[in-house]
Interface confidence: low
């Protein structure tokens, strides 16, 4: 339904508080280097303008599209050329090309300082002095570092952030109350950002059909009692929501997400029995809860799939009449019966089924040709099952840190051209699959593990896309969304790689390592491990283990020494020499 003024419509639907927060997120995700104060000023100007349109929808410029209004506002930033370089050229374009141009300049790895957490008393004082500014700053800092963060979900994080400070700044032991909550929000926030980044990559790189297929599979697993028509409606609406958010249309996205949550709750009887509690919550919590809701129980006595999709004489007729609908029904029926499969596996099975029908429906005897199609699924199902079994055994044997190290070595040998920080970040996250998923029973392991790995490998893909250095990474990232993980798994050691020159500076450590947190210290050691492999890609596990054990002992010894700096200088030289000898460098 058309509105005379889109900005007035969204302001009224969302309310002033959410409107301002979402505009701030949108601006910070586009202009990631701009100071906080500049963004607040722009947001206030947009908000004042929106209010004039609410008062009179016919007022000047109120009929303009949100992209036009927001783009015009962003293009008033005086330092656009100096700060952003060629992004300033976007401002010479007309809509919709201007918005597309801004989107293309979003930076997944912006050159911004690491967020350092101040002392608890300092944070509490800032919170009490100006709660509104404090919370806006949170939105701004997260949004500019995560330019694809799911905006309505960021509002939910901000609400929890506020709740944590409201409670803990009154507590007897503020730090004991607040710090675990902030750690939890940080970790959940990173996970949420990565999950949304995969959704946007799916839409932007592989198109709406790929996203819809993913959504059909996931929603069918989650809502197995819902009819196919109901799942299809939810998929259409969910696709619209994520297309909007990934496209920078955050006001429309938040508004449509609220409508979708409302629809789901009004129709929960025909969707899922697990939604009751979610639907009693306020909007932000409700939407979050629905997105995370557990799978409903499968209906009893579901018939065999073979009847409709293999044995029926009408398979080719049904397929020809409406290919995507028929494949959607196949995916729906398979997914609702298999909450134990990962979404990407279900999509591989659907792709295999599609390929078989394309081939067989043109054959002389179609039925004879596709009669054994389900047999083709067996190896596809067994591959992730075996891989997860092996890796969970390795994780249980090694523990998280050493399991991460094993993956670091494995992935550095596969794609040694990738930057060391990216290899460390991605391998650490890949290693977290162990503690996240291996504790689950068999029936939950695969959806947990393989769908999580899809999210992590997407991080590698988007970081690599910014500075491509490896044809193998490009190939695995671009050829097939659902086969990314099998593609990376299948990579062997890169025999074409020329080892890096040895540089002693890379392995020089100082006393500052002693004051780092355990996590930061691990990252230092893992960085050294990646560099070692880049110098000596043919080093054996045993050789690398010996060097890393020596390195750990060296750090521990020097951190206990009276004169730490001297110890690091002298013992460090010895360690480098011993490591060179051990690895034959």
């Amino acid at each position: 339904d058309a509105h005379k003024s889109e900005v007035a419509h969204r302001f009224k639907d969302l309310g002033e508080e959410n409107f301002k927060a979402l505009v701030l997120i949108a601006f910070a995700q586009y202009l990631q280097q701009c100071p906080f104060e500049d963004h607040v000023k722009l947001v206030n100007e947009v908000t004042e303008f929106a209010k004039t349109c609410v008062a009179d929808e016919s007022a000047e410029n109120c009929d303009k599209s949100l992209h036009t209004l927001f783009g015009d506002k962003l293009c008033t930033v005086a330092t656009l050329r100096e700060t952003y370089g060629e992004m300033a050229d976007c401002c010479a374009k007309q809509e919709p090309e201007r918005n597309e141009c801004f989107l293309q300049h979003k930076d997944d790895n912006p050159n911004l300082p690491r967020l350092v957490r101040p002392e608890v008393d300092v944070m509490c004082t800032a919170f009490h002095d100006n709660e509104e500014t404090f919370l806006k700053k949170y939105l701004y800092e997260i949004a500019r570092r995560h330019p694809y963060f799911y905006a309505p979900e960021l509002l939910f994080f901000a609400k929890r952030y506020k709740a944590a400070f409201t409670e803990c700044c009154q507590a007897a032991d503020k730090a004991a109350c607040l710090l675990p909550k902030l750690d939890e929000l940080r970790d959940e926030g990173k996970a949420s950002s990565a999950k949304q980044r995969l959704k946007c990559a799916s839409l932007q790189k592989f198109g709406e059909r790929a996203f819809k297929a993913w959504a059909v599979a996931r929603l069918s697993q989650r809502f197995p009692k819902a009819e196919f028509a109901e799942v299809s409606k939810l998929v259409t609406d969910l696709t619209k929501v994520h297309t909007e958010c990934c496209h920078g249309d955050l006001l429309e996205c938040a508004d449509d997400r609220a409508d979708l949550a409302k629809y789901i709750c009004e129709n929960q009887d025909s969707i899922s029995s697990k939604l009751k509690e979610c639907c009693e919550k306020p909007l932000l919590e409700k939407s979050h809860c629905i997105a995370e809701v557990e799978n409903d129980e499968m209906p009893a006595d579901l018939p065999s799939l073979a009847a409709d999709f293999v044995e029926s004489k009408d398979v080719c007729k049904n397929y020809a009449e409406a290919k995507d609908v028929f494949l959607g029904m196949f995916l729906y029926e398979y997914a609702r019966r298999h909450p134990d499969y990962s979404v990407v596996l279900l999509l591989r099975l659907a792709k295999t089924y599609e390929t078989t029908l394309e081939k067989c429906c043109a054959a002389a005897d179609p039925h004879e040709c596709y009669a054994k199609v389900f047999d083709e699924f067996k190896p596809l199902v067994e591959e992730p099952q075996n891989l997860i079994k092996q890796n969970c055994e390795l994780f249980e044997q090694l523990g998280e840190y050493k399991f991460q190290n094993a993956l670091l070595v494995r992935y550095t040998k596969k794609v040694p051209q990738v930057s060391t920080p990216t290899l460390v970040e991605v391998s650490r996250n890949l290693g977290k699959v162990g503690s996240k998923c291996c504790k689950h029973p068999e029936a939950k392991r695969m959806p947990c593990a393989e769908d999580y790995l899809s999210v992590v490998l997407n991080q590698l893909c988007v970081l690599h896309e910014k500075t491509p250095v490896s044809d193998r990474v490009t190939k695995c990232c671009t050829e097939s969304l659902v086969n990314r993980r099998p593609c990376f798994s299948a990579l062997e050691v890169d025999e074409t790689y020329v080892p890096k020159e040895f540089n002693a500076e890379t392995f020089t450590f100082h006393a500052d390592i002693c004051t780092l947190s355990e996590k930061e210290r691990q990252i230092k050691k893992q960085t050294a491990l990646v560099e070692l492999v880049k110098h000596k890609p043919k080093a054996t596990k045993e050789q690398l283990k010996a060097v890393m054990d020596d390195f750990a002992a060296f750090v521990e010894k020097c951190c206990k020494a009276d004169d730490k700096e001297t110890c690091f200088a002298e013992e460090g030289k010895k360690l480098v020499a011993a490591s060179q000898a051990a690895l034959g460098l």
């Epitope: 609400k159 509690e277 919550k281 919590e285």
Partner: nanobody, 115 residues
């Protein structure tokens, strides 16, 4: 460990009033929902009234205009003012508080409306 304690129940004549209170002890943060549920003999649990973090309220059709829910954020307290009580309101009334970490219930307080 969070504990909820209800008070204020009792025997009252039709047309009378009662005020139920529920207090939360222990560490509870980020509350987004406080509510009162009731269970009459031989019946299921039904939501009577709820109040969200922004103060918006929701009432069962059977109590609209007679019952009022309110909360005191600073004390983690939730109240239910019940006026014009009817025999059909006889039930055990339970307090429910939800936060980001979980869903907490009290033991219940008996309300009996009888002449």
């Amino acid at each position: 460990q969070v504990q909820l304690v209800e008070s204020g129940g009792g025997l009252v004549q039709p047309g009378g009033s009662l005020r139920l209170s529920c207090s939360a002890s222990g560490s509870i943060w980020g509350i987004y929902h406080m509510g009162w549920y009731r269970q009459a003999p031989g019946k299921g649990l039904e939501l009577v009234a709820s109040i969200t973090v922004d103060g918006s309220t929701h009432y069962a059709d059977t109590v609209k205009g007679r019952f009022t829910i309110s909360r005191d954020n600073s004390k983690n307290m939730v109240y239910l003012q019940m006026n014009s009580l009817e025999p059909e309101d006889t039930a055990v009334y339970y307090c429910d508080i939800r936060n980001v970490g979980g869903d907490y219930w009290g033991q219940g307080t008996q309300v009996t409306v009888s002449s």
